[in-house]
Amino acid sequence: ESLGTEQRVVGRAAEVPGPEPGQQEQLVFGSGDAVELSCPPPGGGPMGPTVWVKDGTGLVPSERVLVGPQRLQVLNASHEDSGAYSCRQRLTQRVLCHFSVRVTDAPSSGDDEDGE
């Protein structure tokens, strides 16, 4: 499934929303990396439209900020992309997933890094 700003037509949902998520995932990326966040819906069923929010502000898709079903990609990340990201159910603002993202000045070595 390709990421991008193209629209997707959605059919009927299978389930109502599940419980809110527990803890926040902490991620570290290097400058210039692509920040990739994934948030599968609880219970596995569609939950209506979703929105990605950074530091309380809704993210709008662009050439650099790509959204897909339950996924977010921020290309060519810089320090300004650091912050608290959440994937929320658009309708209720119920938080589905929570991420703390830190973009370091140094480019990534290519290995996956775990935040503390």
Partner: antibody
Framework: EVQLLESGGGLVQPGGSLRLSCAAS????????MSWVRQAPGKGLEWVSG????????YYADSVKGRFTISRDNSKNTLYLQMNSLRAEDTAVYYC??????????????WGQGTLVTVSS | QSVLTQPPSASGTPGQRVTISCSGS????????VSWYQQLPGTAPKLLIY???KRPSGVPDRFSGSKSGTSASLAISGLRSEDEADYYC???????????FGGGTKLTVL
Amino acid sequence: EVQLLESGGGLVQPGGSLRLSCAASGFTFSSYDMSWVRQAPGKGLEWVSGIYSGDGSIYYADSVKGRFTISRDNSKNTLYLQMNSLRAEDTAVYYCAKDAPTNEPSRFDYWGQGTLVTVSS
Amino acid sequence: QSVLTQPPSASGTPGQRVTISCSGSSSNIGNNYVSWYQQLPGTAPKLLIYADSKRPSGVPDRFSGSKSGTSASLAISGLRSEDEADYYCASWDYSLSGYVFGGGTKLTVL
């Protein structure tokens, strides 16, 4: 001041097509979710379709699925509804409705004045 | 028939308090917010209540919303003649993957 101005309504024969437009001003159009809601003469409100900027998703009411297509042109601040294979029961006033900011609970906080679509032979 | 059920009509005298109900299910009201809209004769709908009980700026505090389980209510206190209108509840329905409206309640101020 937020303004939504629908156009494109009129009389069309059953099986025909029509494209409605909604010109938006007074807000950053590309950042907001938008919907079409219709009201048949003397009847209640019926949500038709919504287009969601946060994840690029589009939803339709079962009654129009496969016949209507919602789209937007952010460069023109305009929302569209392409209506094909029109039926008599599609006769209604069609309203364009703006949703709340994407980091707030969804609701239709501004509405256009509506455009009348009449499907009749 | 609408997914959300409202009484077709309600009435009251000036100064009275009236309540309009909206009944749904776990796939809509039970797991989602409810909003209420007022439609004066010959005009477009106007948002009255959102997120079950919040009022947009400019809406008098005579209007209030509440929700319990799969039902919601709109209360109008200190009824005025200008409140005569149609009132609609709305919510997203997860099983239909779309918004649903109640059939509307015509409020008459006697």
